[in-house]
Interface confidence: medium
């Protein structure tokens, strides 16, 4: 059974207030079986942007179909972008339990916000 | 300038050891991933290990994994391989390759030093 | 592991002439490709990233083009200096990155 990897290629990214913010994500393997978590952040001061099974994320939508048993990619799109929402986002793969817990995360990719062309 | 010179490399017997070591100048060493990139001769390039700026997060290939240890010393600006178990097929030329601050492509490489696994 | 597959093997032009260069990934990178260049004796050196943006110091006769799959580095006029060894490397499925098998650009 192929190791899990979280391949979060951009170490950085940068964008225009107001813009939308792509933020790429890959696994290697579909186990062990659970969700993946996007959060801001790290310890326990980390903010939740997207989980898998629940929601709604009114500003997040996932550039794939994750819903589909095989998917691979859980890249989000993050709109509106606002100096509030810079930061190091991580991709976090959580083990099904009862509750889920934390099985591995991503390298971190960080935001940063430009001012608005005027 | 960013300048990348590797060291280290020779001739040893199957089975013997070798540490290459990588010296940087130019930039702020521990800011950036460092890498091991190979080239046996007549073929092409082989990635062969990846190590962060602080250390923590080390990547291998699946060739060299078990016998090859990546590591770096930030307060002297030096990268190091540490090559145990060696085989035939570890004969290349080990390049020392600096990653860019943003993607993992690499923008600065050094000359090489040529590792020769012969008995 | 993202194979990458470069043709042709062995290019033969003469200088002015047009190269092109072709990479395929066994599946998506997107455009995280770079393009390098290799020459005897020498450190290899980064040409082209984002599948088309040039390096610092590159000159505009290279150029790199492609997203997903397919990929191409064309060098529009060929010079004495451009003949050698030309690689691709993937970036975003990692570890490990991956490099092409190389494509060499001799003079006819």
């Known amino acids: 059974e192929e190791e899990l990897q979280i391949i979060q290629p951009d170490k950085s990214v940068s964008v225009a207030a107001g813009e939308s913010a792509i933020l790429h994500c890959t696994i290697t393997s579909l186990f062990p079986v659970g969700p993946i978590q996007w959060f801001r952040g790290a310890g326990p001061a980390r903010v939740l942007i997207y989980n898998q099974r629940q929601g709604p994320f009114p500003r997040v939508t996932t550039v794939s179909e994750t819903t589909k048993r095989e998917n691979m990619d859980f890249s989000i799109s993050i709109s509106n972008i606002t100096p509030a929402d810079a930061g190091t986002y991580y991709c976090i793969k959580f083990r099904k339990g009862s509750p889920d817990t934390e099985f591995k995360s991503g390298a971190g990719t960080e935001l940063s916000v430009r001012a608005k062309p005027s | 300038d960013v300048q990348l010179v590797e060291s280290g490399g020779g001739v040893v017997r199957p089975g013997e050891s070798l540490r290459l070591s990588c010296a940087a100048s130019g930039f702020t060493f521990s800011s950036y991933d460092m890498n091991w990139v190979r080239q046996a001769p007549g073929e092409g390039l082989e990635w062969v290990s990846l190590?962060?700026?602080?250390?923590?997060?080390?990547y291998y290939a699946d060739s060299v994994k078990g016998r090859f240890t990546i590591s770096r010393d930030n307060s002297k600006n030096t990268l190091y391989l540490q090559m145990n178990s060696l085989r035939a097929e570890d004969t290349a030329v080990y390049y020392c390759?600096?990653?860019?601050?943003?993607?993992?492509?690499?923008?600065?490489w050094g000359l090489g030093t040529l590792v020769t696994v012969s008995s | 592991e993202t194979v990458l597959t470069q043709s042709p093997g062995t290019l033969t032009l003469s200088p002015g002439e047009r190269a092109t260069l072709s990479c395929r990934a066994s599946q998506s990178v997107y455009t995280y490709l770079a393009w390098y260049q290799e020459k005897p004796g020498q450190a290899p050196r980064l040409l082209i990233y984002g599948a088309s943006s040039r390096a610092t110091g590159v000159p505009d006769r290279f150029s790199g083009s492609g997203s997903g799959t397919e990929f191409t580095l064309t060098i529009s006029s060929l010079q004495s200096e451009d003949f050698a060894v030309y690689y691709c490397q993937q970036y975003y499925d990692r570890p490990p990155l991956t490099f092409g098998g190389g494509t060499k650009v001799e003079i006819k």
């Open positions: 190590i962060s700026g602080s250390g923590e997060i080390i």
């Open positions: 390759a600096k990653e860019n601050n943003r993607y993992r492509f690499f923008d600065y």
